[in-house]
């Protein structure tokens, strides 16, 4: 499946479509971010391109989503990893892949994992390889909370708008 | 886990349950489709059986969901694939499995991938095999947009109401 | 990724945060449960710890979520499984892992699978191993319906608040 995306301008046009009013009118905080495909060895979230958006108070700061108002939110993220043939050298040990959505809150001074997915892949046994991870759930969040991600295996990410993303919306 | 489903009539009864009013009353567009288990080499979405439904304007046309009103929607889909050894050779090539939710819009004349998941399985290495793929995210959609799916590995789908599905709801 | 969680008391404080009003005010039934990490060979859902909660009518009884009011709900669950080599033989049998969300309703006298994910892992071939499964979808539910889970491979669960969870919210 080709990682086809819209050009930023086409997507921008779509998002700014005149009179594109929300179904059943009440705006609610929502955000959908995509991994920046130009950054190969890091995972930088972008909101100003393709299908990505920030709405009704959500903002992106220091690669984290800032929760605009207290309430229950559904938070989700996906990553896709891949590897080429003969990428491992003198090992048959597995590659550890993991993706986690974390919460940093004023209420406790550390990152709390909200959503974690993990996988061991065996590049020496199976190559090329591809693996997708998705997770999402509802959480009670407080205004000012920061939602971020941590990923093990970043060099193996398949960075396209439809494969690597992170979002949240108020319920 | 047996792929138990309701008979269409029982499910129909459930959906038309007298006075089954929605929690907190406001109807919002929502749809949940299931893969037709009677079609083994294609993925045809059905809304009139088991737990599937179309509500408040969503319709199904040409195997695509038609977006009834502009706004932000959470769109999701799952597939489960399985296989037996179809070749006794342990050196058989990998099988590429993929599932994608695509958007076709009047705004640009091609299918835009919204959600993509991919996997390589090695039937000769591991048989029988089973693999599940799920994804979902929030997107800004416009009235008349068409949501469809594309799947690589359709002959390997495990078609039951709880394993292969596609849906969306307005936020 | 360490399976860090909040202490129950810290989480409790967070949930009872004074004036923590919901974004855009209308409460809607929502629940997020986590697998009890103290129970190693069963999957017991807990609502009174870490990020878990029951809101606006949802209750937990006999390890099932009770639907408080009729309507459309998004239902989701995740599990993560892991294993170490317990046999070095590459010919060891596969392990069947599965996770299912089931509905028990007054309308029909059996458990109906709503969401199913499945996987075969080959411990002798690939060790250690890790596998994540997630699924979620929208369903029309009736007041009094019971949502529960069934899991194959419970001894292999990685029980932490961010890896094993089950939830639902009204749309």
């Amino acid at each position: 499946l080709p990682g086809v995306g819209l050009t930023p301008s086409a997507a921008q046009t779509a998002r700014q479509h005149p009179k594109m009013h929300l179904a059943h009118s009440t705006l609610k905080p929502a955000a959908h971010l995509i991994g920046d495909p130009s950054k190969q060895n890091s995972l930088l979230w972008r909101a100003n391109t393709d299908r990505a958006f920030l709405q009704d108070g959500f903002s992106l700061s220091n690669n984290s989503l800032l929760v605009p108002t207290s309430g229950i939110y559904f938070v989700y993220s996906q990553v896709v990893f891949s590897g080429k043939a003969y990428s491992p050298k003198a090992t048959s040990s597995p590659l550890y892949l993991a993706h986690e959505v974390q919460l940093f809150s004023s209420q406790y001074p550390f990152h709390v994992p909200l959503l974690s997915s993990q996988k061991m892949v065996y590049p020496g046994l199976q190559e090329p390889w591809l693996h997708s991870m998705y997770h999402g759930a509802a959480f009670q969040l407080t205004q000012g909370d920061q939602l971020s991600t941590h990923t093990d295996g970043i060099p193996h990410l398949v960075l396209s708008p439809s494969t690597v993303f992170f979002g949240a919306f108020a319920l | 886990l047996p792929g138990v489903g309701l008979t269409p009539s029982a499910a129909q009864t459930a959906r038309q349950h007298p006075k089954m009013h929605l929690a907190h009353s406001t109807l919002k567009p929502a749809a949940h489709l299931i893969g037709d288990p009677s079609k083994q080499n294609s993925l045809l979405w059905r809304a009139n059986t088991d737990r599937a439904f179309l509500q408040d304007g969503f319709s199904l046309s040409n195997n695509s969901l038609l977006v009834p009103t502009s706004g932000i929607y959470f769109v999701y889909s799952q597939v489960v694939f399985s296989g037996k050894a179809y070749s006794p050779k342990a050196t058989s090539s990998p099988l590429y499995l993929a599932h994608e939710v695509q958007l076709f819009s009047s705004q640009y004349p091609f299918h835009v991938p919204l959600l993509s998941s991919q996997k390589m399985v090695y039937p000769g290495l591991q048989e029988p095999w089973l693999h599940s793929m799920y994804h979902g995210a929030a997107f800004q959609l416009t009235q008349g947009d068409q949501l469809s799916t594309h799947t690589d590995g359709i002959p390997h789908l495990v078609l039951s109401p709880s394993t292969v599905f596609f849906g969306a709801f307005a936020l | 990724l360490p399976g860090v969680g909040l202490t129950p008391s810290a989480a409790q404080t967070a949930r009872q945060h004074p004036k923590m009003h919901l974004a855009h005010s209308t409460l809607k039934p929502a629940a997020h449960l986590i697998g009890d990490p103290s129970k190693q060979n069963s999957l017991l859902w807990r609502a009174n710890t870490d990020r878990a909660f029951l809101q606006d009518g949802f209750s937990l009884s006999n390890n099932s979520l009770l639907v408080p009011t009729s309507g459309i709900y998004f239902v989701y669950s995740q599990v993560v499984f892991s294993g170490k080599a317990y046999s070095p033989k590459a010919t060891s049998s596969p392990l069947y892992l599965a996770h299912e969300v089931q509905l028990f309703s007054s309308q029909y006298p059996f458990h109906v699978p709503l969401l199913s994910s499945q996987k075969m892992v080959y411990p002798g071939l690939q060790e250690p191993w890790l596998h994540s499964m997630y699924h979620g979808a929208a369903f029309q539910l009736t007041q009094g319906d019971q949502l529960s889970t069934h899991t194959d491979g419970i001894p292999h669960l990685v029980l932490s608040p961010s890896t094993v969870f089950f939830g639902a919210f009204a749309l």
């Epitope: 491992p88 003198a90 040990s93 597995p94 093990d152 | 050196t91 | 250690p128």
Partner: antibody, heavy 114, light 113 residues
């Protein structure tokens, strides 16, 4: 530039313990296993075991099980080898390596002697 | 454990010579599913860390001169230096990574004649 740098070696009394460090730089550390290999003076290479820093999974050579413990701190991109109940025959240069990329550290000498 | 046996344990050669080192494993290192041999060759000079030369029995690591080649399958493997250079005088080790524990051959020391 990729580097693995071992430290923590030195003179230890028989029966004593020590902790060796392996600091990685120039690549993402957490997904790739760190192996520990040792070489006694004038002898060949001996595999001690390995750790997956991200997952915490370990594999030990049975000969070292109970005396060697692997750990890792992902925030510091550093893996550790703790060796207990040291004997004269544990005198060796200890190397850490990342077999996935083929990187090796320069080694650190541990001498067990009274 | 898989035993790895190298021969010879040492050899003397001159610059320009063709040198062959063999390595035998006590069980097959060939993984039938992908037809790959889980064997590596290392070069070690005095006071230095081992350097990876060959992996998957025959794949040269980046930056390794083409005069080094690996061959063999199953239980019998060979490292060949087609034309020995002054910087090639060192000790060479084979290693299997097919199963745990990983094991090395005892080494072959290549000395100047």
């Amino acid at each position: 530039e990729v580097q693995l740098v071992e430290s923590g070696g030195g003179l230890v009394q028989p029966g004593g313990s020590l902790r060796l460090s392996c600091a990685a730089s120039g690549y993402t550390f957490s997904s790739y296993w760190i192996e520990w290999v040792r070489q006694a003076p004038g002898k060949g290479l001996e595999w001690v075991g390995e750790i997956s820093p991200g997952s915490g999974s370990t594999n030990y050579n049975e000969e070292f099980k109970g005396r060697a413990t692997f750990s890792a701190d992902n925030s510091k991109n550093t893996a550790y080898l703790q060796m207990n109940s040291l004997r004269a025959e544990d005198t060796a240069v200890y190397y850490c390596a990342d077999g996935y990329h083929g990187y090796w550290g320069q080694g650190t000498l541990v001498t067990v002697s009274s | 454990d898989i035993q790895m046996t190298q021969s010879p344990s040492s050899l003397s050669a001159s610059v320009g010579d063709r040198v062959t080192i063999t390595c035998k494993s006590s069980q097959s290192l060939l993984y039938s599913a992908n037809q790959k041999n889980f064997l590596a060759w290392y070069q070690q000079k005095p006071g230095k860390a081992p350097k990876l030369l060959i992996y998957w029995a025959s794949t040269r690591d980046s930056g390794v001169p083409s005069r080094f080649s690996g061959s063999g399958s199953g239980t019998d493997f060979t490292l060949t230096i087609s034309s020995l250079q002054p910087e090639d005088f060192a000790t060479y080790y084979c290693q299997q990574y097919y199963s745990y524990p990983r094991t090395f051959g005892q080494g072959t020391k290549v000395e100047i004649k």
